[in-house]
């Protein structure tokens, strides 16, 4: 009886199991009982990343510099090009089709995680004892100055945006 299912890396056509084309190659003609599946390598700037019966290869992704993109990994006949963003920018999606400027953490917030090409800056509020007085994509919350270790006293309390102000101790006469 003719087959109704085929092995892995095969496909059923005309009551026959034909070999799929390997990654990096496209289908030119189905197999017959006299000749194997005819496959051809993908052209320059094309790829296919699976065992397939595609008659056309996919175009490599274009990393458009106008969108802040650059090539992270050049595509091959078996893999797509991987784009990433220029320094200071990050991808807007997992597919990295465009970039946006890294977010800065406002005063009162510090950088919890520095941005990468694929993820934005993560900010966190400065907890008690810490402050940030700048808008930055790199600066963490800094601890308040310890007046005691400088043999000084707090003259003005710190906030999440300002450091404490130290001053000399009042001397009792």
């Amino acid at each position: 009886e003719p087959p109704t299912a085929c092995r892995e890396k095969q496909y059923l056509i005309n009551s026959q199991c034909c070999s799929l084309c390997q990654p990096g190659q496209k289908l030119v003609s189905d197999c017959t009982e006299f000749t194997e599946t005819e496959c051809l390598p993908c052209g320059e700037s094309e790829f296919l990343d699976t065992w397939n019966r595609e008659t056309h290869c996919h175009q490599h992704k274009y990393c458009d510099p106008n969108l802040g993109l650059r090539v992270q990994q050049k595509g091959t006949s078996e893999t797509d090009t991987i784009c990433t963003c220029e320094e200071g920018w990050h991808c807007t999606s997992e597919a990295c089709e465009s970039c946006v400027l890294h977010r800065s953490c406002s005063p009162g917030f510090g950088v919890k995680q520095i941005a990468t090409g694929v993820s934005d800056t993560i900010c966190e509020p400065c907890p008690v004892g810490f402050f940030s007085n700048v808008s930055s994509a790199f600066e963490k919350c800094h601890p308040w100055t310890s007046c005691e270790t400088k043999d000084l006293v707090v003259q003005q309390a710190g906030t999440n945006k300002t450091d404490v102000v130290c001053g000399p101790q009042d001397r009792l006469r």
Epitope: N14, S15, Q16, T32, E33, F34, T35, E36, E38
Partner: antibody, heavy 117, light 107 residues
Amino acid sequence: EVQLLESGGGLVQPGGSLRLSCAASGFTFSSYAMSWVREAPGKGLEWVSGIGSYGGGTYYADSVKGRFTISRDNSKNTLYLQMNSLRAEDTAVYYCARYVNFGMDYWGQGTLVTVSS
Amino acid sequence: DIQMTQSPSSLSASVGDRVTITCRASQSISSYLNWYQRKPGKAPKLLIYAASSLQSGVPSRFSGSGSGTDFTLTISSLQPEDFATYYCQQYGRNPPTFGQGTKLEIK
């Protein structure tokens, strides 16, 4: 035992026709693709035509396309090759062969076709 | 059509010799190649399929190798019954095509 027996060869004039037969026995004929291969005097082997098993698709070498027709009668376990518009260059011994996994594992003894005036 | 070129066209060797016949395809055919043995007055016999797989019942002194465009048939130790004509045949593209044959003769 697998056996393939060709018949129908002979002398024919250019432009004439001939029908070759191949009687198969010893295996389930309908389950196998079959083909015709020829060998011209002093030349090598040339694949002429093939016919699939279940789908029954037919395939031809460019040199015979449009002139030769392959067919099969599974009820009679017989393979045929209808040859029309014969030319001198078709002179050869014609073999029928059984196909398995893209190879011809059993062949007949051949029948001679001579095209001459 | 794919052209198959065998070399040499003829070859003289002695019993016990190791013999290699080569077959070159005009374009890549992966490993889609068969080898046949042909003796005068007899039907061809399938020796090797898929470039390197030994057909059932064929002695192990026969072996095949290669992929892409270059293939070889090796007989490790020639026996008297091995003197014959050998053909390669591709099945990577329609139509299947044969090499012109290599005639192996007794030296």
